[in-house]
């Protein structure tokens, strides 16, 4: 038997993916477990194998269909169970009635690109990936810029309180290498959280013109 505190957390990417992490203190690393999903109003059910991601946590993804297909709605409830093999039987280790649109975590923004760069400013755009049309414009973004000699954790957060897939960074230093990241969050959902950060976009400001004050 497995004892200790257990945590079972799942997020819906708003389209066709439910990602789950189960952590259990004192669980054996070679325990054979799966997540089982049973929607209340769909004619399918699904499972995925939980694979270790650290000493005491396991993760898996339920792929509900094509990446951009809308597989669940705001009225769906999916019963999610962690089942672990004990001899010839399965033991339910954790269970939750999962409301997809209360537990959202979108995919990281993609296609970051520099639209225009000058000596002191840079205009950057991006796209959101696999986000439900249900949100319409009800999304917010956070962005951060990595300056030379600093860490990402030290970078101040810039908040965009609307669906704005671009930003104009100001007061930059000429001829300097920067990196930029952005993440997205729907306004909907009690347990909704930020997406992962996007892949960093590296850019360099233009050098100051010779003979001019900067």
């Amino acid at each position: 038997a497995v004892n200790g505190t257990s945590q079972f957390t799942c997020f819906y990417n708003s389209r066709a993916n439910i990602s789950c992490v189960w952590s259990q203190d004192g669980a054996l690393q070679d325990t054979s477990c799966q997540v089982h999903a049973w929607p209340d109003r769909r004619r399918w059910n699904q499972t995925c194998e939980l694979l270790p991601v650290s000493q005491a946590s396991w993760a898996c993804n339920l792929i509900l269909g094509a990446p951009d297909s809308q597989k669940l709605t705001t009225v769906d409830i999916v019963t999610l169970r962690v089942l672990c093999r004990e001899g010839v039987r399965w033991r339910v280790m954790a269970i939750q009635d999962f409301k997809p649109f209360e537990n959202l975590r979108l995919m990281a923004p993609i296609s970051l690109q520099v639209v225009h760069v000058e000596t002191h400013r840079c205009n950057i755009s991006w796209e959101i990936s696999q986000a439900s049309h249900y949100f319409e414009r009800h999304l917010e973004f956070e962005a951060r810029t990595l300056s030379p000699g600093h860490t990402w954790e030290e970078a101040p957060l810039l908040t965009l309180k609307q669906k704005q897939e671009w930003i104009c960074l100001e007061t930059l230093t000429p001829d300097t290498q920067y990196e930029f990241q952005v993440r997205v969050k729907p306004l909907q959902g009690e347990f909704t959280t930020w997406s992962p950060w996007s892949q960093p976009l590296a850019f360099r400001t233009k050098p100051a013109a010779l003979g001019k004050d900067t």
Epitope: S32, Q34, R43, W44, N45, Q46, T47, C48, E49, L51, C60, N61, L62, I63, L64, G65, R85
Partner: nanobody, 123 residues
């Protein structure tokens, strides 16, 4: 891309057993769930069972639970369906199918299919 080829179908009598085999080739099957479905003439494709890639976790339709057994031979890259106590209602074309990362009971979730093997159970 995964290629699937079923074999083992044929004509049997009521009460007989039959073992179907699905040979999988192509890329690594480390994350691939394999399922068996069947389709009788004029009917929808029905889910029978699926098996997971690493731990061989299985899931069965209630209609075949206890009578059909799905198993995986990793070395041979095959997934077998052992069918016992066959009845005329089991007559159908049997298909194996594959999908990545999670198993599903819905046929439309699968993107790779074999060509099927006919099973006929006579009374």
């Amino acid at each position: 891309q995964v290629q699937l080829v079923e074999s083992g179908g044929g004509l049997v009598q009521t009460g007989d057993s039959l073992r179907l085999s699905c040979a999988a080739s192509g890329r690594s099957l480390d994350t691939t769930y394999i399922a068996w479905f069947r389709q009788a003439p004029g009917k929808e494709r029905d889910f029978l069972a699926y098996i997971s890639p690493r731990f061989s976790h299985t899931w069965y339709a209630d209609s075949v639970k206890g009578r059909f057994t799905i198993s995986r031979n990793i070395a041979k890259r095959t997934v077998d369906l052992e069918m016992n106590s066959l009845e005329p209602e089991d007559t159908a074309v049997y298909y194996c199918a594959a999908r990545e990362h999670s198993g599903s009971t819905a046929w439309e979730h699968y993107d790779h299919w074999g060509q099927g093997t006919q099973v006929t159970v006579s009374s």
